[in-house]
């Protein structure tokens, strides 16, 4: 079998066997290596010298194998923005970032730049899980059957109506999507004021 | 070269708060982490949050939230950790470091004694 | 929270042995692993960063490997003033956490 080509190697069509790992020079017409990720192009290539690679500099990185004659400069997430980290930056990685707690991303650029605050969600409903947490708005859905929720909240669950006999009490009132059922000892008769609440 | 220089030891009682500072040169204070970590008495290290001084934004171990405050004076230089609510298990020594693919540059740490 | 196991707790050893120590993490931290030597009464001392990149000033002796969850801190030679308590620390995402540490003590 024919030996591979190291780089710099004579390219014709001005493309490269490793689309990945080198690059078309075409100043010479030739195939160099690129940098690896945490590095950056400190000296060109020519046709008798490969490209020579230096590590980033503290506080810059480059993510992918590059060409690139400098690094790019860690930025912070923008808290202003409604951002949090979650890893740091490093010479191989941007800062990663996500919404807080309670937001949802409002725009997005290749990644999140901006989140706003979640929507609450009325009384008798909850937010849908959703697959990613801070992907998208609430989407309120009504509580199954035997379950209720009594705020408007951005997170709060739609909770099982309480069951009274469990407790060795009847049931008073029936709850509803919006209110707990009401509960009343056995005994005692309802009194008229009572809506809502639960007597032991 | 770069220099973080922490304040001097504590001993304080339960349930009051104590104040770390710790003073960087060498370098832009501006555009680097500050991290926060502790180690009490013959155990490991324990990473208690950072501040990014350039836009003085703190995040925090979750365990320490609303218990720790961390902040930063862009004029002098200087972080600071305020951990408050103090019971004897906070009995530790505090370092400041600075980050960059892990700890490179720590401060020589301050030890802060809780008891009654 | 990741957890950064580390092993042996402590070990014996005499000049001149070879010593290995290990830290597994409990999730894939990539290679955002650095290592740590500490003596009584003084901060931490960086070894090592990205799992295997050995900081300027620390001794050859001292080389660091792997990626995913398994790391080692190998030291070739053990030389006097080489005891001391190693620990590992992963830095992929908050919060960072530490290994708990190993002694290394003289024989």
């Known amino acids: 079998s024919q030996p591979q080509a190291v780089p710099p190697y004579a390219s014709e069509n001005q493309t490269c066997r490793d689309q990945e790992k080198e690059y078309y020079e075409p100043q010479h017409r030739i195939c160099c290596s690129r940098c690896p990720p945490g590095t950056y192009v400190s000296a060109k290539c020519s046709r008798i010298r490969d490209t020579v690679c230096a590590t980033c500099a503290e506080n810059s990185y480059n993510e992918h194998w590059n060409y690139l004659t400098i690094c790019q400069l860690c930025r912070p997430c923008d808290p202003v923005m409604g951002l949090e980290e979650i890893a740091p930056c490093t010479s191989k990685r941007k800062t990663q970032c996500r919404c807080q707690p309670g937001m949802f991303c409002a725009a997005w650029a290749l990644e999140c730049t901006h989140c706003e605050l979640l929507s609450d969600c009325p009384p008798g409903t909850e937010a849908e899980l959703k697959d990613e947490v801070g992907k998208g708005n609430n989407h309120c859905v009504p509580c199954k059957a035997g379950h209720f929720q009594n705020t408007s909240s951005p997170s709060a669950r739609c909770q099982p109506h309480t069951r009274c006999e469990n407790q060795g009490l009847v049931e008073a009132a029936p709850g509803t999507a919006q209110s707990d059922t009401t509960c009343k000892n056995p005994l005692e008769p309802l009194p008229p004021e009572m809506s809502g609440t639960m007597l032991m | 070269q770069v220099q973080l220089v922490q304040s001097g030891a504590e001993v304080k009682k339960p349930g009051s708060s104590v104040k770390v500072s710790c003073k960087a040169s060498?370098?832009?204070?501006?555009?680097?982490?500050l991290h926060w970590v502790r180690q009490a008495p013959g155990q490991g290290l324990e990473w208690m949050g950072w501040?990014?001084?350039?836009?003085?934004?703190?995040q925090y171990n979750e365990k320490f939230k609303g218990r720790v405050t961390i902040t930063a004076d862009k004029s002098t230089s200087t972080a600071y950790m305020e951990l408050s609510s103090l019971r004897s298990e906070d009995t530790a020594v505090y370092y400041c470091?600075?980050?960059?693919?892990?700890?490179?540059?720590w401060g020589q740490g301050t030890t802060v004694t809780v008891s009654s | 929270d990741i957890q950064m196991t580390q092993s042996p707790s402590s070990l014996s050893a005499s000049v001149g042995d070879r010593v290995t120590i290990t830290c597994k993490a409990s999730?894939?931290?990539?290679?955002?692993v650095a290592w740590y030597q500490q003596k009584p009464g003084k901060a931490p001392k960086s070894l090592i960063s990205?799992?295997?990149y050995r900081y300027s000033g620390v001794p050859s002796r001292f080389s660091g490997s792997g990626s995913g969850t398994d790391f080692t801190l190998t030291i070739s030679s053990l030389q006097p003033e080489d005891f001391a308590t190693y620990f590992c620390?992963?830095?992929?995402?908050?919060?960072?956490?530490f290994g708990q540490g190993t002694k290394v003590e003289i024989k």
């Open positions: 470091a600075r980050s960059w693919e892990g700890f490179p540059y």
């Open positions: 060498g370098y832009t204070f501006t555009t680097y982490y």
């Open positions: 501040i990014y001084p350039g836009n003085v934004h703190a």
């Open positions: 999730q894939n931290v990539g290679i955002n």
């Open positions: 990205s799992a295997s």
């Open positions: 620390q992963q830095y992929d995402t908050y919060p960072f956490t």
